[in-house]
């Protein structure tokens, strides 16, 4: 069943077929007997009861009132009574845009990340059974969509979707065609959950080292899910039995990004692995971010500053 | 609209340097990183290199180490693959596009080296 | 480098018949910390750029139909067009992302029987 019409405030559109609808329908089925009645007000006139001798274009069934359409006159407040029960409504009818398929104040927005799933669903379940057909338009140009009843779009968004998309539904009422149109501004945006990322720490790091010790090289940045880290060095990696890449370490942060970390253990270090670069590249769909890492003997280590140490 | 516009065609001779632009509009440009590949006439498709538009950072490809520049200008959304010491084997269709799956292409610019 | 080998390097089909191209990385392009394949297909036309299809092994593009799909994973991997149309007809090439230089397969090339 067609929910009530809770909202206080509802702005329509001239020519449309328009309902409201009291939100204690299923009370007033079972106090059958109870007298229901609904009333307009409007500038100078106080609670005029409707019903419908009031006007041709008005429809009165167990729980609404409708419009067959709603034209500019029709704006004013509207109030439901029944025994205790009040209910009001404050009506705008606004004009039709004659030089468009839709009106603009009535457009609902909604922003969708490209690649990211999108979906319009042409439906008016109220006039369902009434509906001959329906169209769907993309800036006032016909969609050629399979079904004609329920037109839908479903697919992962891509920039070029972007814009108003217009649901127009034909329906025949008392021999009379109308059309109820309901439009979307879809605005299509880059994926907002994505960051650059970040190597953490300083970008050029010497390390003090002895010749026939071990010693561990840390790279840590905050990446995205799909975001890559990993070690390069020498001419292909690898070559070197001495030098090792750990499992790379992740944890999920709370903005749902990531901080990873990966071990580069170089055993026994030769005169080999001195003054030579160590790379760790972090890559992404943005480019990459590089940090090196250059061991040094001890013994030569007054020759740099002490800035420029990692320990 | 999404897309990648790049400069005209050029004919060089052998030594020469080529310039090609390539413009982006209808995203945010520092998003991806634009990667340039080439197509000799009637082969597969070369892997040239890549800059990082958010921190200009480059990685080309080994056999074109020293002879190809990678630039972007952030202030007109545009990146820029330079090429010199231009030999007849750089004939090519020369193509910019964006992010490391390449979803998004320019038409291409047909570079002829010929004396 | 990683080395892309594409198989085979042409393909007759019939139309309406199933087209099965593969592609073979010489190192693994699976990135065991997200479990994700750095690898994508490509179709290019005569005269036109390159058109993505595929990304992550078996993500389709959008806009992409449904009769193209991806799989496989770490070095193994497979485009299948599930019935073959005619405006298919293509060089189809594969390409990994996984460490630079990004590396494309040698291209195949689909016709029809």
């Known amino acids: 069943a067609e929910s009530c019409t809770s909202r206080p405030h509802i702005t329509v559109v001239e020519g449309e077929p328009f309902y409201l609808k009291h939100c204690s329908c299923s009370l007033a089925h079972e106090i059958e007997t109870t007298t229901k009645s609904w009333y307009k007000s409007s500038g100078s006139q106080e609670h005029v009861e409707l019903n419908p001798r009031s006007s041709s274009r008005i429809a009165l069934h167990d729980c609404v009132l409708e419009f067959w359409p709603v034209e500019l006159n029709d704006t004013g407040s509207y109030f439901f009574q029944m025994k205790n029960y009040t209910q009001k409504w404050k009506l705008n009818v606004i004009r039709r845009n004659k030089h468009s398929c839709f009106t603009e104040r009535q457009v609902t927005s909604k922003i969708v990340e490209v690649k990211k799933f999108f979906q319009i669903t042409c439906e008016n379940s109220y006039y369902q059974t009434l509906v001959n057909s329906t169209s769907l338009y993309k800036n006032c140009k016909k969609l050629l969509l399979e079904n004609n009843k329920n037109p839908t779009i479903k697919k992962n968004a891509e920039f070029e979707d972007q814009g108003y998309y217009s649901c127009v539904h034909f329906l025949h009422h008392n021999g009379k065609l109308f059309n109820i149109t309901k439009t979307f501004n879809i605005t299509i945006v880059e994926d907002r959950s994505n960051i650059v990322p970040v190597l953490l720490g300083p970008k050029l790091n010497h390390v003090a080292v002895e010749l026939g010790k071990n010693v561990r090289l840390n790279c840590s940045a905050l990446l995205n899910e799909e975001d890559v880290i990993y070690w390069m060095f020498g001419e292909e990696n690898g070559s070197d039995p001495n030098i090792h890449e750990e499992k790379e370490m992740r944890i999920m942060t709370p903005e749902g990004k990531w901080h990873a970390s990966k071990v580069l253990r170089i055993e026994n270090i030769g005169e080999s692995n001195l003054n030579v670069l160590y790379n760790c590249t972090v890559a992404s769909t943005g480019g990459t971010d590089t940090k090196s890492f250059i061991l040094v003997r001890k013994a030569d280590m007054a020759d740099i500053p002490g800035h420029v140490f990692t320990r | 609209q999404v897309q990648l516009v790049q400069s005209g065609a050029e004919v060089k001779k052998p030594g020469a340097s080529v310039k090609v632009s390539c413009k982006a509009s209808?995203?945010?440009?520092?998003?991806?990183?634009i990667s340039w590949v080439r197509q000799a006439p009637g082969q597969g498709l070369e892997w040239m290199g890549w800059?990082?538009?958010?921190?200009?950072?480059?990685n080309y490809a080994q056999k074109l180490q020293g002879r190809v520049t990678m630039t972007t200008d952030t202030s007109t959304s545009t990146a820029y693959m330079e090429l010199r010491s231009l030999r007849s084997d750089d004939t090519a269709v020369y193509y910019c596009?964006?992010?490391?799956?390449?979803?998004?292409w320019g038409r291409g610019t047909l570079v002829t080296v010929s004396s | 480098d990683i080395v892309m080998t594409q198989s085979p390097d042409s393909l007759a089909v019939s139309l309406g018949e199933r087209a099965t191209i593969n592609c073979k990385s010489s190192?693994?392009?699976?990135?065991?910390?997200?479990?994700?394949?750095?690898l994508a297909w490509y179709q290019q036309k005569p005269g036109q750029p390159p058109k993505l299809l595929i990304y992550?092994?078996?993500t389709r593009e959008s806009g992409v139909p449904d009769r193209f799909s991806g799989s496989g994973s770490g070095t193994d991997f497979t485009l299948t067009i599930s019935s073959l149309q005619a405006e298919d007809v293509a060089v189809y090439y594969c390409?990994?992302?996984?460490?630079?230089?990004?590396?494309f397969g040698q291209g195949t090339k689909l016709e029809i029987k």
């Open positions: 190192q693994t392009v699976l990135y065991s910390s997200n479990n994700k394949n750095y």
């Open positions: 390409q990994q992302y996984y460490r630079t230089p990004y590396t």
């Open positions: 800059i990082s538009v958010y921190n200009g950072n480059t």
């Open positions: 209808g995203y945010t440009f520092s998003s991806y990183g």
């Open positions: 992550w092994s078996s």
């Open positions: 596009t964006r992010g490391w799956y390449f979803d998004l």
